[in-house]
């Protein structure tokens, strides 16, 4: 918990650079997120592909979508979970991260020093230890999160599913419902690649205790959606006289010394004819 | 035929607590959430929350939070509404209802005949 | 919240009347739905998503609007139409009904 109060921003005298003043795991251990580069990369054949259950969420559900002033975040169901992992991961919810419109490179996770557009973070509890996320967001193995990263390409129909909402919740504390869609379209193509490492919470109280999985080929969303994402939320309360745009909601890369990260993939990526073109 | 049959209605004290139940019945149970939607006499419609009885996920109007609690008995297709410290302002009656979704929004298709609950002393 | 301004509160009109409901929002939202209650009954749907009758519905009924102003119309009123009609949006937590238009017989 907080030493005092909960206020911290991204920019200005709260931002992260303070966060760690009031939030001392922020300067602690384990911190995320961090830069996927060749030499701290290591193979490991034991990483097999995760299976994602109860990921196809009815239309007939209603799902919250919630501007927290931090960033907008769907919560999921308590069904929803990863298999494949130590334990069984339960969804609670999911958020992005992103930059701005002069800058649109507002990844967490960096891969050889470049941010992509954005990130997608679906954030998992330990439901056979924990009764639920907040019990389980301090204790060792008590979160698994699944990162993907975004690039600029072509129109994303999925991400569409929750960027059309957003005008309902464009100040902090606003909500709307979403209707239940399949998550997994989320996830870019071959989710059995992927990067795997032990962090931390990348927003206070920065608790060293997720299983990250960033998967290693990023999803497409079109330069609309993203300038759509960039421009149509506010930090602040619709009634704050002093507005504050929701934009470059990401972290900096953290140290990462005398650790690895592991790979389900050994480290050559194989040209298809096509891109050979 | 799809029904919903709400119960457990009637006199309560002030501060006293009530608990209504909801019974499903002509359809996959849990592949619809359950509304608690209430009704002042001669006023209109107020939502209390929802619950997932798939999984007994609830999402509450804020106006309720701490006060309602809906809970799901998933064997015997009923979910249950529980309210506390109740005022005379909680007389209504109280309808669970099942929204359904159809092209690109929900709306309720289903309604019980809804249960009459008095707050006086 | 999204508040829901429905007016009039109440009209008395004779059958064959055109008859027009007003359901104004406070903020925008996607969607109107309108739902009919008679006395001691239920409420059951009747315009869905703005604009689309509910099967049964008879077609003297319609719903138009966007934004924040809806409305309902009845083209020729009918002895069975004399009831009660709430607006109803799901954009925003909490869904919010409208306070409700009682149409009487004159």
């Known amino acids: 918990a907080p030493v005092n109060g909960s206020k911290w921003t991204y920019f200005g005298p709260d931002g992260e650079n303070s966060w760690s003043k009031k939030y001392p795991s922020c300067g602690g251990l384990l911190q995320s997120p961090i830069d996927l580069h060749s030499d701290i990369l290591q193979y490991d054949a034991s990483l097999t592909p995760l299976e994602f259950q109860g990921y196809n969420l009815s239309a007939n559900k209603q799902f919250l979508l919630t501007n927290n002033g931090h960033s907008v975040k769907l919560n999921l169901p308590s069904d929803m979970h990863i298999q494949g992992l130590q334990s069984r991961y339960s969804a609670t919810q999911l958020h992005l991260h992103w930059g701005n419109p002069n800058d649109p490179h507002g990844s967490e996770h960096t891969v050889s020093g470049q941010h992509f557009a954005a990130e997608l973070h679906i954030v998992h509890y330990n439901s056979d230890l924990y009764p639920d996320a907040s019990t389980a967001s301090n204790k060792s193995e008590g979160l698994a999160v699944l990162a993907v990263l975004i690039e600029m390409g072509s129109f994303n129909p999925s991400y569409d599913k929750i960027f059309s909402h957003l005008q309902h919740v464009k100040y902090k504390g606003q909500e709307a419902f979403v209707p239940g869609f399949n998550i997994e379209e989320l996830l870019p193509e071959r989710t059995a690649e992927y990067y795997r490492y032990r962090g931390s919470l990348t927003t206070p109280p920065c608790n060293p205790t997720v299983l990250w999985t960033v998967f290693r080929n990023p999803v497409q969303i079109s330069q609309e959606q993203l300038l759509a994402l960039e421009t149509a939320l506010y930090c602040t309360h619709m009634d704050d006289p002093s507005p504050r745009e929701m934009i470059n909601n990401f972290r900096q890369v953290q140290k990462f010394d005398e650790r690895l990260v592991y790979t389900s993939f050994s480290q050559v990526q194989v040209c298809t004819a096509a891109g050979l073109s | 035929e799809v029904q919903l049959v709400e119960s457990g209605g009637g006199l309560v004290q002030p501060g006293g607590s009530l608990r209504l139940s909801c019974a499903a019945s002509g359809y996959s149970y849990t592949d619809y959430n359950i509304y608690w939607v209430r009704q002042a006499p001669g006023k209109g419609l107020e939502w209390v929350g929802y619950i997932d009885p798939a999984n007994g996920d609830t999402t509450y109007n804020q106006k309720f939070k701490g006060r309602a609690t809906i809970s799901v008995d998933k064997s015997k297709n009923t979910a249950y509404l529980q309210m506390n410290s109740l005022r005379a302002e909680d007389t209504a009656v109280y309808y669970c209802s099942r929204p359904i979704y159809y092209g690109a929004y929900w709306y309720f298709d289903v309604w019980g005949q809804g249960t009459l609950v008095t707050v006086s002393s | 919240d999204i508040q829901m301004t429905q007016s009039p509160s109440s009209l008395s009109a004779s059958v064959g009347d055109r008859v027009t409901i007003t359901c104004r929002a406070s903020s925008s939202v996607t969607y109107m739905h309108w739902y009919q209650q008679k006395p001691g009954k239920a409420p059951k749907p009747w315009i869905y998503a703005t604009s689309e009758l509910m099967s049964g519905v008879p077609s003297r009924f319609s719903g138009s609007g966007s934004g924040t102003d809806f409305t309902l119309t009845i083209s020729s009123l009918q002895p069975e139409d004399f009831a009660t009609y709430y607006c109803?949006?799901?954009?925003?937590?909490?869904?919010?009904f409208g306070q409700g238009t009682k149409v009487e017989i004159k």
């Open positions: 109803q949006q799901w954009s925003s937590n909490p869904l919010t």
